[in-house]
Interface confidence: medium
């Protein structure tokens, strides 16, 4: 804790300036005044300050404004933004994009994941929805921060906004974000023709149900290795071979490679051997000839 | 890579000046400030000042106050220091070192040193 | 200002040794320590930061301890290449400040 003592008259500060960098951790808390401090944050970051000084600075707003900072000290934290917690950040009411776009830049090349999630998730809950200006700036700012958002604010996203994201937006979206965002994205790009909808679509089929995956194996559309791997596991094991084989196409041979990763290897174990036979991969582990199966879960859901 | 490139070698005589400068490279030159250190023979290192190219505002160590004056020049990713009214006590090697002042606030790079001799 | 004071200026070792440099700060700086070393004809190179975070791509015969006014920079097992001048720094209050230095010689 940052001693409390009176600051000398010499030492009295009435401008935020470089002069503040020679003053001890104790001078800044007894001369600075928080109030001054927050009128005149656009200058903190014009000034060298140490890490240490910059805490001293962050404890004196916190004790002026402890329900949160408002936004127009948001907007003029600069560096000092490195210094704030997801617990300081989920106090604050953002609506402006270009708060957060000056936040976003600040954090780059820093590990603040934890806090740029929960900065987005407070501009989300502030400007209402996850409207399409809020998706541009994420995009351009902060690739991939969309899928630090919970599916739950996601949920806010209007399927007219879909079209804004790239496929780079997507790569660490989970499966439950994933599910959110298929069906914004089915109607979204409902329609568009046949090749033209599984270029849109294809990175959002990790939310896909067996019915789509099972519709797209009719339409010739060669799905690439990688994002079959993405696709659920549970969409992918009532997919008979010859499904499978005509939804990769060319890209069938890919599957030896991923024999032993799921869903190929949950979906191998799933088909009988003769059928897995006849892509002529060498793929094995598949039910073999002679074997009655059995689906349990069918018996179960009827007792 | 990053990469802090000095100027070369400078020989001058005692009352005149010098201006080191330091091109960054591989990096982005407004995300990180500069400082500049003095390593003279017998003495450890000293501290001049530092300089945030995104802003231009510089500060400096009260000994080097009127003798060192840093500058900045964002187009060309460059910064400099000027030394005046030079003497012997100023012959040393200067570096030029970045600082992610809020982030671990160490000089995580350096440039390679320019050796300056001031002599009659 | 805050004077940073290697006690040892010169410290001599054999490969293998576990090297312990000393380094003493006046007054309180938390843990806002870092260690440089510098090899002849060379600038010197960023070691620990924060008085014990190893920066990248150091070996981790590095270690770096202490906070408050004591710290240390420990090499566990000494190679040649390791001969060099190591300083301290303070950058817990401004003009940031050095120690004179300590140099690792061969016995």
């Known amino acids: 804790d940052v001693e409390r003592t009176t600051c000398p008259p010499e030492k009295e500060v009435h401008e935020i300036d470089e002069s503040l960098i020679f003053y001890k951790k104790r001078e800044l808390e007894a001369c600075v005044d928080a109030a001054l401090l927050a009128a005149q944050m656009d200058r903190v970051d014009a000034i060298p300050f140490t890490y240490e000084q910059l805490d001293v600075l962050k404890h004196k707003l916190d004790e002026l404004y402890p329900q949160g900072y408002p936004e127009s000290v948001i907007r003029h934290l600069g560096h000092l933004f490195l210094k704030m917690s997801p617990e300081d950040i989920r106090k604050w009411n953002v609506t402006s994009l270009e708060t957060l776009k000056a936040l976003l830049k600040v954090s780059k090349g820093h590990e603040m994941s934890a806090q740029v999630a929960t900065l987005i998730d407070r501009v989300v809950v502030g400007r209402g929805q996850l409207d399409k200006d809020t998706v541009d700036t994420l995009t351009a700012f902060c690739p991939g921060c969309l899928c630090s958002l919970s599916p739950e604010r996601l949920s806010s996203v209007p399927p007219s906004v879909i079209g804004a994201v790239r496929p780079q937006d997507l790569d660490t979206c989970g499966p439950r974000q994933l599910d959110v965002l298929y069906p914004k994205a089915r109607l979204a790009f409902q329609n568009m023709s046949g090749s033209e909808y599984f270029v849109k679509i294809r990175p959002f089929l990790g939310g896909a149900p067996t019915e789509d995956v099972k519709a797209l194996s009719q339409q010739n559309v060669s799905m690439d290795l990688a994002t079959f791997m993405k696709l659920r596991r549970e969409a992918v094991l009532p997919l008979t071979v010859a499904e499978v084989q005509k939804l990769l196409g060319p890209h069938v041979e890919g599957l030896k490679v991923e024999e032993q990763h799921s869903p190929v290897r949950d979906w191998i174990l799933k088909q009988r051997q003769d059928d897995l036979d006849t892509l002529g991969l060498g793929l094995q582990g598949g039910i073999p000839n002679g074997y009655l199966i059995l689906d349990l879960s069918v018996r179960e859901a009827l007792s | 890579e990053f990469q802090l490139q000095q100027s070369g070698p400078e020989l001058v005589k005692p009352g005149a000046s010098v201006k080191i400068s330091c091109k960054a490279s591989g990096y982005s030159f407004t995300d990180y400030n500069m400082n500049w250190v003095k390593l003279s023979n017998g003495k450890s290192l000293e501290w001049i000042g530092v300089?945030?190219?995104?802003?231009?505002?510089?500060s400096y160590n009260q000994k080097f106050k009127g003798k060192a004056t840093l500058t900045v020049d964002q187009s060309s990713s460059t910064a400099y220091m000027q030394l005046n009214s030079l003497t012997s006590e100023d012959s040393a090697v200067y570096y030029c070192a970045r600082w992610d002042n809020y982030y671990g606030s160490s000089l995580d790079y350096w440039g390679q040193g320019t050796t300056l001799t001031v002599s009659s | 200002d805050i004077v940073m004071t290697q006690s040892q200026k010169f410290m001599s070792t054999t490969v293998g040794d576990r090297v312990s440099i000393t380094c003493k700060a006046s007054?309180?700086?938390?843990?806002?320590v870092a260690w440089y070393q510098q090899k002849p004809g060379q600038s010197p190179k960023l070691l620990i930061y924060?008085?014990?975070n190893r920066y990248t791509g150091v070996p981790d015969r590095f270690t770096g301890s202490g906070s408050g006014t004591d710290f240390i920079l420990t090499i566990s097992n000494m190679q040649s290449e390791d001969l060099a001048d190591y300083f301290c720094q303070q950058y817990s209050s401004y003009p940031l400040t050095f120690g004179a230095g300590t140099k690792l010689e061969l016995k």
């Open positions: 300089i945030i190219p995104n802003y231009g505002t510089s």
């Open positions: 007054q309180n700086v938390g843990t806002a």
């Open positions: 924060s008085a014990s």
